[in-house]
């Protein structure tokens, strides 16, 4: 199994209960809150890994600007419904009956309603703006170290294919990184966006998800790179559905 | 060879809480996770909960989220579970399981509770 | 949660005959599922994993099949001593599920 054997922990998830049991006696690791077996080879999902938190004992320009109908997760932690292959579920519903559609990096996408509320397929996020402002330094970062010393922690730490990192702009101390995956391009076994830039988000703000592994220490040319800000938008195959007293 | 000792019977007043031992033996004890499974007479399973004895780890069935409570004792290799305020709804057979964290290899004779005034 | 339903709830047979048991997940649960037996006042006991996987010291007889959402145990020569309840248990995800189960009896 892809579980470290020796002890048996799960090297990309911290947010699991891993035991010699599994078939075979090889070694298990179920997401907490859900129960569901993950692939400790691999970044685990984002819908996984909100449950198992919820279940915790919480001018000229170069930078993108985002669509206009670019989603900003303003509704922060839930306690979501997974699939049975850990993703998102189009419909989410709180305790109260309150209802809402999700894309697949289960950010709402619709005003909220009743039980009534009918989500047809699950929208996939094919495009995700992280849009970084890093602490004052000495000076500038170096524009092509920065974007090799990201791309290369994207490809190293998040295992996602370097070809889903569509760009790195700079222009200090603004830092957007763009990643972009349509349903076409992904292939088995690719790791998500949704997923790497949940777990990047999760590593700048100091709570790493990798099991025993430091916090995550950027460095470009040996220079910290010590972000003090993060927003991430999320850019929609199909553009979200929302009522015009939302968008004044 | 693995062994989980259940005591045959508990006699029980209703509102007096009671706790079932299921005690393991023949394997490391804190490698595998204690399953807890209700049976009332002539009725199916029921899933209960599960414990992980190397760091007690519990998840429960919603339904028995407030009346069963789980816990373990590395020392004596036993796991326990509460199960508070108990009415004759709660009168059944429990089965303490283990050896696995999927199909459950390993099950105890289970506990007949009787909950009776 | 996910739900299993077993069918049928009875299922009467003649010694020598074969005999399938079905569990139905309300989800794809992949080979997550196991079966049990279990005779009058006895505990359970498990007879296949993931589906289609052999337990060591059971009969041969025994054997499971199916993935996804149907699933199927079936004993190909049944003997008098197979007379018990049978269960279907998903460890998809928790809480983990036990089918409502099915008795067997020998005609």
């Known amino acids: 199994h892809t579980a470290a054997q020796d002890n048996c922990t799960c090297p990309t998830n911290k947010m699991t209960v891993c035991s010699p049991d599994g078939p075979g006696g090889r070694c298990q690791c179920r997401a907490l809150g859900s129960g569901m077996a993950v692939d400790c080879s691999t970044l685990t999902s984002k819908c996984l890994l909100l449950k198992a938190r919820m279940s915790a004992p919480k001018n000229a320009r170069t930078l993108v600007r985002p669509s206009e109908h670019a989603l900003v997760d303003n509704d922060g932690l839930y306690d979501p419904d997974c699939d049975p292959e850990g993703r998102f579920k189009a419909r989410q519903c709180n305790q109260t009956s309150v209802c809402w559609c999700v894309n697949s990096v289960g950010v709402r996408r619709t005003d909220k309603g009743d039980l009534s509320l009918r989500c047809d397929e699950l929208v996939r996020t094919h495009h995700i703006l992280i849009d970084l402002r890093h602490r004052p330094t000495a000076g500038a970062f170096n524009h092509s170290d920065l974007d090799a010393e990201l791309r290369r922690l994207f490809r190293e730490r998040y295992r996602l294919h370097p070809k889903f990192v569509a760009a790195v702009h700079y222009e200090q101390p603004t830092i957007q990184i763009e990643l972009r995956q349509n349903t076409s391009q992904k292939a088995a076994g690719d790791v998500d966006i949704g997923d790497a830039a949940y777990y990047f988000e999760r590593d700048i703000k100091g709570e790493s998800l990798f099991q025993g592994r430091g916090g995550l220490d950027l460095r470009v040319r040996g220079e910290p790179l010590q972000v003090e800000r993060t927003l991430i938008y999320y850019l929609d195959e199909i553009p979200p559905k929302f009522s015009m007293k939302r968008l004044t | 060879q693995v062994q989980l000792q259940q005591p045959g019977a508990e006699l029980v007043r209703p509102g007096a809480s009671v706790n079932l031992s299921c005690k393991a033996s023949g394997y490391t004890f804190t490698s595998y996770w204690i399953n807890w499974v209700k049976q009332r007479p002539g009725q199916g399973l029921e899933w209960i909960g599960n414990i992980y004895p190397s760091n007690s780890y519990t998840n429960y069935n919603q339904k028995f989220k407030d009346t069963a409570t789980l816990t373990v004792d590395k020392s004596s290799s036993t796991a326990y579970m509460q199960l508070s305020s108990p009415t004759s709804e709660d009168s059944a057979v429990y089965f303490c399981?283990?050896?696995?964290?999927?199909?459950?290899?390993?099950w105890g004779q289970g506990t007949l509770v009787t909950v009776s005034a | 949660d996910i739900l299993l339903t077993q069918s049928p709830a009875i299922l009467s047979v003649s010694p020598g005959e074969k005999v399938s048991f079905s569990c139905r997940a309300s989800?794809?649960?992949?080979?997550?599922i196991h079966w049990y037996q279990q005779r009058t006042n006895g505990s359970p006991r498990l007879l296949i994993e993931?589906?289609?996987e052999s337990i060591s010291g059971i009969p041969s007889r025994f054997s499971g099949s199916g993935s996804g959402t149907d699933f199927t145990l079936t004993i190909n020569s049944v003997e008098s001593e197979d007379i018990a309840d049978y269960y279907c248990?998903?460890?998809?995800?928790?809480?983990?599920?036990f089918g409502g189960g099915t008795k067997l009896e020998i005609k």
């Open positions: 993931f589906a289609s």
């Open positions: 989800q794809n649960i992949g080979t997550s």
């Open positions: 248990q998903q460890s998809n995800s928790w809480p983990f599920t």
């Open positions: 399981s283990s050896y696995r964290s999927d199909g459950f290899a390993y």
